[in-house]
């Protein structure tokens, strides 16, 4: 029997064992987080699947993910939201130590999808494990990109108090308007709920003593945020290794000096 024709995309296909992975992650998350014990993981998977299965994978919309967002609704306490841009690993290492702060990937929906790829095919109930649309080469309205845009928008919209963002000081554009942070989250912080955005610029080189808070792209971020009536603060994190160590052991004598 000849295999049925399948759309070829430029990106890698759906992550192996995607349904099992999502379900297993959901069960694990709800076991570890008492406030989410009421979540029915089968319903969550059904809503996740419903967002992209049998739909043309270059025509996915935010609306498609709203049922999943509805089931995964979670609140972060004020002052406890940590956004990040191009420095995911350090942000996650930080919240693993500072347990009362949360990145998107510490929330149920972000946790379910972190590092996974998925897509379906128009008019079939199959998942495409061969290839999925690439954001640049194929289309931006693909299942993965739209998912992250949707949940990132919601995460920013619900933030309150002082919001923190970790930025990568080693990149040519420390603040990139085209990143998810720059294109989605910045514009969805609610001025009536968010008093300030505090940027932590993470230095890469050990001998780098420049004040990266004076970088032109940081000034651009400050301008965008200030125009939205949200105060802006910036801190250099010169030694990320020491920074993490001091989060773990704040009483350490070396932590009294700058990091």
């Amino acid at each position: 029997v000849l295999p049925r024709w399948r759309q070829q995309w430029s990106g890698s296909g759906t992550t192996s064992r995607f349904p099992e992975t999502v379900l297993a992650r959901c069960v694990k998350y709800t076991e570890v987080h008492p406030e989410m014990r009421h979540v029915d993981c089968q319903s969550v998977w059904d809503a996740f699947k419903g967002a992209f299965i049998s739909k043309y994978p270059c025509n996915i919309t935010e609306e498609d993910y709203q049922p999943l967002v509805k089931l995964g609704t979670q609140t972060v306490p004020c002052n406890k939201t940590l956004l990040w841009s191009r420095i995911k690993d350090l942000a996650h290492q930080f919240t693993q130590v500072q347990r009362d702060m949360f990145t998107l990937e510490d929330m149920l929906l972000g946790y379910l999808a972190d590092d996974l790829t998925w897509c379906g095919e128009f008019n079939t109930f199959e998942i495409n494990y061969q290839s999925c649309p690439d954001w640049r080469k194929d289309c931006s309205n693909n299942p993965v990109s739209v998912f992250w845009k949707t949940v990132s928008r919601r995460f920013a919209e619900t933030a309150c108090g002082v919001v923190h963002v970790m930025l990568n000081g080693s990149r040519s554009k420390i603040f990139d308007k085209n990143s998810t942070f720059g294109s989605v989250e910045v514009h969805n912080l609610q001025p009536e709920k968010v008093q300030a955005l505090e940027a932590w610029v993470i230095h890469g080189g050990r001998e780098d003593s420049r004040d990266l808070c004076q970088d032109p792209t940081i000034k651009e971020l400050e301008s965008i945020i200030s125009k939205r009536n949200i105060r802006f603060f910036c801190k250099n994190i010169y030694r990320p290794d020491k920074f993490l160590q001091c989060v773990k052991n704040p009483e350490d004598s070396s932590c009294l000096s700058g990091i």
């Epitope: 029915d40 319903s43 419903g50 609306e63 709203q66 509805k70 919209e157």
Partner: antibody, heavy 119, light 107 residues
Framework: EVQLLESGGDLVQPGGSLRLSCGAS????????MSWVRQAPGKGLEWVAD????????WYADSVKGRFTISRDNSENTLYLQMNSLRAEDTAVYYC????????????WGQGTTVTVSS | QSVLTQAPSASGTPGQRVTISCSGS??????VSWYQQLPGTAPKLLIY???ERPSGVPDRFSASKSGTSASLAISGLQSGDEADYYC??????????FGGGTKLTVL
């Protein structure tokens, strides 16, 4: 034929209770989110409550939160609305409706059952 | 107070094209559906998922959505189209919300 049939509407005194039922036929009831929507005399439609396909999640309008409870029995293909602490402003025709793929729209409606709250 | 705003009334003569609008911030990221309620009857789904028609709904009924507003167009107006028309969507809390309704009169 796809059908929803409400029952249980009545005249009840303020502070009283009532349970509405909605029987479903012609579709796989357990696959669909369901809603209750009401319409006060001469007024527009007002969403009241939703329940997920498996019954594990429920959502309510602020106006009924803490007083009304939506539930379902998938083995009996029946949707319920338990209404307690009824007020005059709860007087309305109550419709049950099937949700098409969560948020596409409400594609099947019952004929409605009338609840009157008055002393 | 509904977060979806509709004009209370609209009118047209037989054969004409009329448009009913619906606006609200939650429309931007949520599907819009449209319902027709003939006098003394239950609502009926006319449009789902912003612009799609269920089978059995004539193609005289069409809809569109742009940004925070949506509209329903009825062409070739007939006396039988006289009814109340409601838009619906999910609100910012991801719960259903209906517009206040537009009463369509065929002159």
């Amino acid at each position: 034929e796809v059908q929803l049939l409400e029952s249980g509407g009545d005249l009840v005194q303020p502070g009283g209770s009532l349970r509405l039922s909605c029987g479903a036929s012609g579709f796989t009831f357990s696959d669909h989110y369901m809603s209750w929507v009401r319409q006060a005399p001469g007024k527009g439609l007002e969403w009241v409550a939703d329940i997920s396909a498996r019954g594990s999640n429920t959502w309510y309008a602020d106006s009924v939160k803490g007083r009304f409870t939506i539930s379902r029995d998938n083995s009996e293909n029946t949707l319920y609305l338990q209404m307690n602490s009824l007020r005059a402003e709860d007087t309305a025709v109550y419709y049950c409706a099937k949700n098409w793929n969560y948020n596409y729209g409400m594609d099947v409606w019952g004929q409605g059952t009338t609840v009157t709250v008055s002393s | 107070q509904s977060v979806l705003t509709q004009a209370p009334s609209a009118s047209g003569t037989p054969g004409q094209r009329v448009t009913i609008s619906c606006s609200g911030s939650s429309i931007q990221n949520n599907y819009v559906s449209w319902y027709q309620q003939l006098p003394g009857t239950a609502p009926k789904l006319l449009i789902y998922r912003n612009f799609e028609r269920p089978s059995g709904v004539p193609d005289r009924f069409s809809a569109s959505k742009s940004g925070t507003s949506a509209s329903l167009a009825i062409s070739g107006l007939q006396s039988g189209d006289e009814a109340d028309y409601y838009c619906a969507s999910w609100d910012d809390s991801l719960n259903w919300v209906f517009g206040g309704g537009t009463k369509l009169t065929v002159l």
